[in-house]
C-alpha cells in the first residue's frame, strides 16, 4: 500500500515539477523591439515611434502583444521596462537645422480602460553638435520597475526622431515580467 | 491508513518544497565582473577587454564562466545584461592628443559552433574634452534581454580604453538568467 | 482507498501549488522611489538624497523599507539595481554659478553590523552649460547585480542636487530580487 | 615621408620675443598634436608645449607657462612656437615634433625636425 | 611631477658587447608609458621603443626595452658602431612628459 502510494506520488510529483518550472520559467512575458528603420519619421518635434520589429535578429516577443506601435500587456505583473535609445549624425547626410538639440525619449503608458498616457520614464540631453565635428553620436538608457495591468500599453516618443540610429543593437526597448502582483 | 499518507506527503512535500526553492532561485545563473584596471590597453581604437574581475569586492558569478576575457553562458535562457563604462581623464594623467573623442562600448555576443560575433548593445557618445578643464567625466550604460545558448560567449569593446575609469563601482558588466527558453 | 488518495493528493497539491507560486512569485522583495522634491538640498556638493516617495504615482515598495532617505534591505538576496536621475537647469531660474559642471550619481550600500559605506555604482558625465542655451538637461542610469544582506541600506549620493529634475518618471531608483543567495 | 623642418631661431636680447615656425608635409596635419620640445647646448630634452590636432587645446610646461605661446595653422601646415620675455635659459636647440596620433593623450615623439637654435643673450 | 634617473650616467662599452641602460621613475609610470630615444652628436634624437616594450618602425631588434612600474631598461643584445650615443626615456603617462637626463654610451 504505502509503498505504492509513495512510487505513484514520485510520478506525480516529477511531472508537476517539470509543469511547475515551465509554468513558472517559461510562461513569464517578455519583448525585446529593435527599431524598423523603414519608417521612422522625420522633423525635431517629438513623436511617437510606431514601427518596431518583434521577430527578427534580437527582436522577440512572447506572452505579450506588439500592435499599432505599441507593446501590450497580456498578463498582469511586475515588469522590467528598459530602453536603449541612439541618435547620430554624420555630415555626409547633410547640415544640421541647429547645433542645439534636445535628444530625448519617454517611456509611456496608456491604459486603454481609462483612457489616458502618463510617462514612467524620461532620459536624454541637451546637446551642441558644432559643425567643427563631422561625426556625432549619443545614446540614452533608461530602466524601471514597474507594477502593468493586462491591457495597458507601452509605447516610446523620442524627440529628433530623424537622428535615430537605426541599427538593432542600438535603438531598442523591451520589458519582462519578474513578478506577480500580491 | 490516510492520515499516515498525510503525514508522509506533507514530509515529502516539504523537502521538495526546498528542493523546488533551491533548484529554481539558487541555480540561475548571474556574473557581474568589474574591470581589471592592471592590463588597460592604450590607443584609442577600439579593443576588446579582456581583463575583469570575477571574484573580489563586488564581482561575482555562479553558473556561468568567465575564461580568455569572456563571459560564456553554460546554461541555455532568456537573460539580462548590462554594462557600464566610465570614461575620465584628469590633466595630471596627461594631455588630451584630440578634444574630439568617440567614447563608445559594445557588448558583443560570439557563437563557437558558428564562428561569428555580433553586437547586441551598443552605447556611447561623441564628446568634446577641451584642455581648459582640469577633469572630465562620462558614463555610458546599457542594457536588454537577450536569449543565450550554453557555449555563447559574451565580451565588451571599447573606443579610447586608455581612458577607462579603473574603480569596481564604474567600470563594469554582468548578466543574469531571467527564464527559461521554451 | 488509492482513488481517494489520488483525489485528496490533486486537492493537496492544488492548494500547494498556488501556495509556492504565491510564495515565489510575490514574496519577491523589489521598491522604486521616486525623488521627492519637496526637500531637495541646494548646493552643488556632493550630498545623500534623503526624499524619496514610496506609496504614491510609480513609487511602491515590498518587502523591503524605507527609512530615514534608505532603502532597507529585509531580505537576503541578489538584487537588481538601478538608478535613473536626471539633472536640467533653465535660464529662468537664475545663472548657473558655474558653466563647468560635475552631475553625477553615485549608488552606496552600507552596513550597519561593520559601519561602513560603499559605492557599488556611479555614473555621470562632466557638462559644459553655456549661458548661450536657454535650457539644459542631462540624464544618467545605472544598474547592477549585486548581494545584499537584510539589514544593508542603499542610498543615493549626487552632485548638483539643486538641479534635480523632481518628476516621478525621471529621478527614481530602485531593486528588485531576482534569486537567493547560495 | 613625414618631414618637419623649422625655422625662426637666431639670437635675441633677454626680454626680447621670436617666433619659431615649423612647416609639415608628408602627413594629414590637423589630424595629429604636435610639441616642441628643446635643448640647451650640451644639456637634456625639455618638453615646451603641446598642441591639439585642432588646435583647440594647447599645453605648456611650467617653465615657459604665460610667455610662449603655440600655435597652428592647418591651412599652412604650419606649427608656430611665439616666444615672449626671453631669458638666457631659454637659450636651446628648439625641435618641433609629432605626436604618434595611435593614444588619445600625448605620448611619445615621432619624427622630429633638425631643430632651431635659438640663443639669448645681451 | 615624476623625475626620471637613468644610470649609469656613462657606459663604456666595446662594440659587439651587450648595453644595459637603466630608467628608474619617482613614482609609479602608468599603463608602461614610457618611450627610448637615441640622439647622436648635431641630430634630433630618434624614437626607439614606445609602450616600454614596442621598438618603433625600422628600429633594428637588437634593441628591446622592458620592465613596468618604476624600473624600465633599455637592452642592446650587440652593439654596433652606429649605436653609440646618447639614450633618454621619455614617460607620457602623467603631464607633463617629462625625460630622463641620459646616458651616454661611448666606445671603451
Known amino acids: 500500500g504505502s509503498q505504492h502510494i509513495r512510487a505513484e506520488k514520485a510520478m506525480v510529483d516529477g511531472s508537476w515539477l517539470d509543469l511547475a518550472k515551465r509554468s513558472k520559467l517559461e510562461a513569464q512575458p517578455f519583448a525585446h523591439l529593435t527599431i524598423n528603420a523603414t519608417d521612422i519619421p522625420s522633423g525635431s518635434h517629438k513623436v511617437s515611434l510606431s514601427s518596431w520589429y518583434h521577430d527578427r535578429g534580437w527582436a522577440k516577443i512572447s506572452n505579450m502583444t506588439f500592435s499599432n506601435g505599441k507593446l501590450i500587456v497580456n498578463q498582469d505583473g511586475f515588469y522590467y521596462l528598459y530602453a536603449n535609445i541612439c541618435f547620430r549624425h554624420h555630415e555626409t547626410s547633410g547640415d544640421l537645422a541647429t547645433e542645439y538639440l534636445q535628444l530625448m525619449v519617454y517611456v509611456t503608458k496608456t491604459s486603454i480602460k481609462i483612457p489616458s498616457s502618463h510617462t514612467l520614464m524620461k532620459g536624454g540631453s541637451t546637446k551642441y553638435w558644432s559643425g567643427n565635428s563631422e561625426f556625432h553620436f549619443y545614446s540614452i538608457n533608461v530602466g524601471g520597475f514597474f507594477k502593468l495591468r493586462s491591457g495597458e500599453e507601452i509605447s516610446i516618443e523620442v524627440s529628433n526622431p530623424s537622428l535615430l540610429d537605426p541599427d538593432q543593437d542600438a535603438t531598442y526597448f523591451g520589458a519582462f515580467k519578474v513578478r506577480d502582483i500580491d | 491508513g490516510s492520515q499516515h499518507i498525510r503525514a508522509e506527503k506533507a514530509m515529502v512535500d516539504g523537502s521538495w518544497l526546498d528542493l523546488a526553492k533551491r533548484s529554481k532561485l539558487e541555480a540561475q545563473p548571474f556574473a557581474h565582473l568589474t574591470i581589471n584596471a592592471t592590463d588597460i590597453p592604450s590607443g584609442s581604437h577600439k579593443v576588446s577587454l579582456s581583463s575583469w574581475y570575477h571574484d573580489r569586492g563586488w564581482a561575482k558569478i555562479s553558473n556561468m564562466t568567465f575564461s580568455n576575457g569572456k563571459l560564456i553562458v553554460n546554461q541555455d535562457g532568456f537573460y539580462y545584461l548590462y554594462a557600464n563604462i566610465c570614461f575620465r581623464h584628469h590633466e595630471t594623467s596627461g594631455d588630451l592628443a584630440t578634444e574630439y573623442l568617440q567614447l563608445m562600448v559594445y557588448v558583443t555576443k560570439t557563437s563557437i559552433k558558428i564562428p561569428s560575433s555580433h553586437t547586441l548593445m551598443k552605447g556611447g557618445s561623441t564628446k568634446y574634452w577641451s584642455g581648459n578643464s582640469e577633469f572630465h567625466f562620462y558614463s555610458i550604460n546599457v542594457g536588454g534581454f537577450f536569449k543565450l545558448r550554453s557555449g555563447e560567449e559574451i565580451s565588451i569593446e571599447v573606443s579610447n580604453p586608455s581612458l577607462l575609469d579603473p574603480d569596481q563601482d564604474a567600470t563594469y558588466f554582468g548578466a543574469f538568467k531571467v527564464r527559461d527558453i521554451d | 482507498g488509492s482513488q481517494h488518495i489520488r483525489a485528496e493528493k490533486a486537492m493537496v497539491d492544488g492548494s500547494w501549488l498556488d501556495l509556492a507560486k504565491r510564495s515565489k512569485l510575490e514574496a519577491q522583495p523589489f521598491a522604486h522611489l521616486t525623488i521627492n522634491a519637496t526637500d531637495i538640498p541646494s548646493g552643488s556638493h556632493k550630498v545623500s538624497l534623503s526624499s524619496w516617495y514610496h506609496d504614491r504615482g510609480w513609487a511602491k515598495i515590498s518587502n523591503m523599507t524605507f527609512s530615514n532617505g534608505k532603502l532597507i534591505v529585509n531580505q537576503d538576496g541578489f538584487y537588481y539595481l538601478y538608478a535613473n536621475i536626471c539633472f536640467r537647469h533653465h535660464e529662468t531660474s537664475g545663472d548657473l554659478a558655474t558653466e563647468y559642471l560635475q552631475l553625477m550619481v553615485y549608488v552606496t550600500k552600507t552596513s550597519i553590523k561593520i559601519p561602513s559605506s560603499h559605492t557599488l555604482m556611479k555614473g555621470g558625465s562632466t557638462k559644459y552649460w553655456s549661458g548661450n542655451s536657454e535650457f539644459h538637461f542631462y540624464s544618467i542610469n545605472v544598474g547592477g547585480f549585486f548581494k545584499l544582506r537584510s539589514g544593508e541600506e542603499i542610498s543615493i549620493e549626487v552632485s548638483n542636487p539643486s538641479l534635480l529634475d523632481p518628476d516621478q518618471d525621471a529621478t527614481y531608483f530602485g531593486a528588485f530580487k531576482v534569486r537567493d543567495i547560495d | 615621408e613625414v618631414q618637419l623642418l623649422e625655422s625662426g631661431g637666431g639670437l635675441v636680447q633677454p626680454g626680447g620675443s621670436l617666433r619659431l615656425s615649423c612647416a609639415a608635409s608628408?602627413?594629414?596635419?590637423?589630424?595629429?598634436?604636435m610639441s616642441w620640445v628643446r635643448q640647451a647646448p650640451g644639456k637634456g630634452l625639455e618638453w615646451v608645449s603641446g598642441?591639439?590636432?585642432?588646435?583647440?587645446?594647447?599645453y605648456y610646461a611650467d617653465s615657459v607657462k604665460g610667455r610662449f605661446t603655440i600655435s597652428r595653422d592647418n591651412s599652412k601646415n604650419t606649427l608656430y612656437l611665439q616666444m615672449n620675455s626671453l631669458r638666457a635659459e631659454d637659450t636651446a636647440v628648439y625641435y618641433c615634433?609629432?605626436?604618434?596620433?595611435?593614444?588619445?593623450?600625448?605620448?611619445?615623439?615621432?619624427?622630429w625636425g633638425q631643430g632651431t637654435l635659438v640663443t639669448v643673450s645681451s | 611631477e615624476i623625475v626620471l634617473t637613468q644610470s649609469p650616467g656613462t657606459l663604456s662599452l666595446s662594440p659587439g658587447e651587450r648595453a644595459t641602460l637603466s630608467c628608474r621613475a619617482s613614482?609609479?609610470?602608468?599603463?608602461?608609458?614610457l618611450a627610448w630615444y637615441q640622439q647622436k652628436p648635431g641630430q634630433a634624437p630618434r624614437l626607439l621603443i614606445y609602450?616600454?616594450?614596442s621598438r618603433a618602425t625600422g628600429i633594428p631588434d637588437r634593441f628591446s626595452g622592458s620592465g613596468s612600474g618604476t624600473d624600465f631598461t633599455l637592452t642592446i643584445s650587440r652593439l654596433e658602431p652606429e649605436d653609440f650615443a646618447v639614450f633618454y626615456c621619455?614617460?607620457?603617462?602623467?603631464?607633463?612628459?617629462?625625460f630622463g637626463q641620459g646616458t651616454k654610451v661611448e666606445i671603451k
Open positions: 615634433a609629432k605626436d604618434p596620433g595611435t593614444t588619445v593623450i600625448m605620448s611619445w615623439f615621432d619624427p
Open positions: 608628408g602627413f594629414t596635419f590637423s589630424s595629429y598634436a
Open positions: 598642441i591639439t590636432g585642432s588646435g583647440g587645446s594647447t
Open positions: 613614482q609609479s609610470v602608468r599603463g608602461r608609458y
Open positions: 609602450g616600454a616594450s
Open positions: 621619455q614617460q607620457y603617462g602623467s603631464s607633463p612628459r617629462i
